[in-house]
Interface confidence: low
C-alpha cells in the first residue's frame, strides 16, 4: 500500500480582526481572512477576522449575499483590511461606521 | 443593555475650557461609534462629534477647531474637550453610542457658562 | 450640512387622537431617517430606525413612513404616557443633523 503524502504545513496569513469573537485581539492568524455583514435587529453588523480550517472558510465564502449576510473572503496578510462587504440591496452603515458591529 | 456613566465640570466662565468624560459599561467598546450631543435650555439637538475606539473622529464643522474628542480604551471612556467656551455653550451635554441610530445615552451634564 | 425641518413644532390632541408629525430634508437622504421621543428631564430615546424600523419594545401605535426628502411619523392613538418632544435625525451624511423638534401636549 503507497504511504499517505506527508501534508505540508498550510500557509498562514495575518488578519485583521474586529468584533466580539476577537475579544482584545485586533488580528487573528489563519488560512484565510474574511470581512462580514449581517443585518441583526435591523443594525448593520460588520466583523473581520480569519478562518484557521481552510474548508470551514471554503464553505462560508462560497455562499452568495443574501440580502441579511454578506461574507468577502481572501488570502494574504492583512487582505481584509480594506475589505468591507457589501449586502446586495441598497444600504448603508452609519458614516465612517465601518467594521463595526452591534453588540 | 450598554450603560453610559458622564461626568465634567458643570459651571465655566467665559473663555474655559469644557472637559467631560464617559464611560461605558457592559458593552464592546470597538461595538459602537461615541458621540457627543448638546442640548440648550429649551431647545433642540446638536451633535458635536463622533470617535471610534481606535481614535478615529468625525466633528461637527460648525464648531470649527474647538471641539476635540479622544478616547481611552483601557479604561472604557472617551471624552469631550470644548475650548474657548461662551453663553451660546450653555447645554446639557450627552455622551451616546451609535451604529445608525442613537441607541444609548448618558444621564446628561448640565453644563453653564456664566462670567 | 442638510436641514432638518418639522412641523408643528408644538400641537396639542385629546388622548386617543391621531397624531402627525413631519419631517423635510433639505435634499434627498436616501431613507436614512430615525425619530426620537424625548420626555422632560430625560435623555432622548430612539423609537424608529430607517424611517419606519420600530425598535424592539416600542409600542406599534407609533409608525413612520416617507421617501426622499419627506417623511412622517405618526401615533395612532395617543395616549397621555406619550407626551414628550419628538425629533427626527438623518444619518446620510455628516455632520448628523436632527430636526428642530415637535412637542405633542394632551388637550
Known amino acids: 500500500m503507497e504511504d499517505e503524502k506527508p501534508k505540508v504545513n498550510p500557509k498562514l496569513y495575518m488578519c485583521v480582526c474586529e468584533g466580539l469573537s476577537c475579544g482584545n485581539e485586533d488580528h487573528c492568524e489563519g488560512q484565510q481572512c474574511f470581512s462580514s455583514l449581517s443585518i441583526n435587529d435591523g443594525f448593520h453588523v460588520y466583523q473581520k477576522g480569519c478562518f484557521q480550517v481552510y474548508e470551514q472558510g471554503k464553505m462560508t465564502c462560497k455562499t452568495p449575499p443574501s440580502p441579511g449576510q454578506a461574507v468577502e473572503c481572501c488570502q494574504g496578510d492583512w487582505c481584509n483590511r480594506n475589505i468591507t462587504a457589501q449586502l446586495p440591496t441598497k444600504g448603508k452603515s452609519f458614516p465612517g461606521t465601518q467594521n463595526f458591529h452591534l453588540e | 443593555q450598554v450603560q453610559l456613566q458622564q461626568w465634567g465640570a458643570g459651571l465655566l466662565k467665559p473663555s474655559e475650557t469644557l472637559s467631560l468624560t464617559c464611560a461605558v459599561y457592559?458593552?464592546?467598546?470597538?461595538?459602537?461609534?461615541w458621540s457627543w450631543i448638546r442640548q440648550p435650555p429649551g431647545k433642540g439637538l446638536e451633535w458635536l462629534g463622533e470617535i471610534n475606539h481606535r481614535g478615529r473622529t468625525n466633528n461637527n464643522p460648525s464648531l470649527a477647531s474647538r471641539v476635540t474628542i479622544s478616547v481611552d480604551t483601557s479604561k472604557s471612556q472617551f471624552s469631550l474637550r470644548l475650548t474657548s467656551v461662551t453663553a451660546a455653550d450653555t447645554a446639557t451635554y450627552y455622551c451616546?453610542?451609535?451604529?445608525?441610530?442613537?441607541?444609548?445615552w448618558g444621564q446628561g451634564t448640565r453644563v453653564t457658562v456664566s462670567s | 450640512d442638510i436641514q432638518m425641518t418639522q412641523s408643528p413644532s408644538s400641537l396639542s390632541a385629546s388622548v386617543g387622537d391621531r397624531v402627525t408629525i413631519t419631517c423635510q430634508a433639505s435634499?434627498?437622504?436616501?431613507?436614512?431617517l430615525n425619530w426620537y421621543q424625548q420626555k422632560p428631564g430625560q435623555a432622548p430615546n430612539l423609537l424608529i430606525y430607517?424611517?419606519?424600523n420600530l425598535l424592539p419594545g416600542v409600542p406599534s401605535r407609533f409608525s413612520g413612513s416617507g421617501s426622499g426628502t419627506d417623511f412622517s411619523f405618526t401615533i395612532s392613538s395617543l395616549q397621555p404616557e406619550d407626551i414628550a418632544t419628538y425629533y427626527c435625525?438623518?444619518?446620510?451624511?455628516?455632520?448628523?443633523?436632527f430636526g428642530g423638534g415637535t412637542t405633542v401636549a394632551i388637550r
Open positions: 430607517d424611517v419606519f
Open positions: 457592559n458593552g464592546s467598546f470597538s461595538s459602537f461609534y
Open positions: 451616546t453610542a451609535h451604529t445608525r441610530g442613537f441607541l444609548y
Open positions: 435634499q434627498d437622504i436616501n431613507n436614512y
Open positions: 435625525q438623518h444619518y446620510d451624511d455628516l455632520p448628523l443633523t
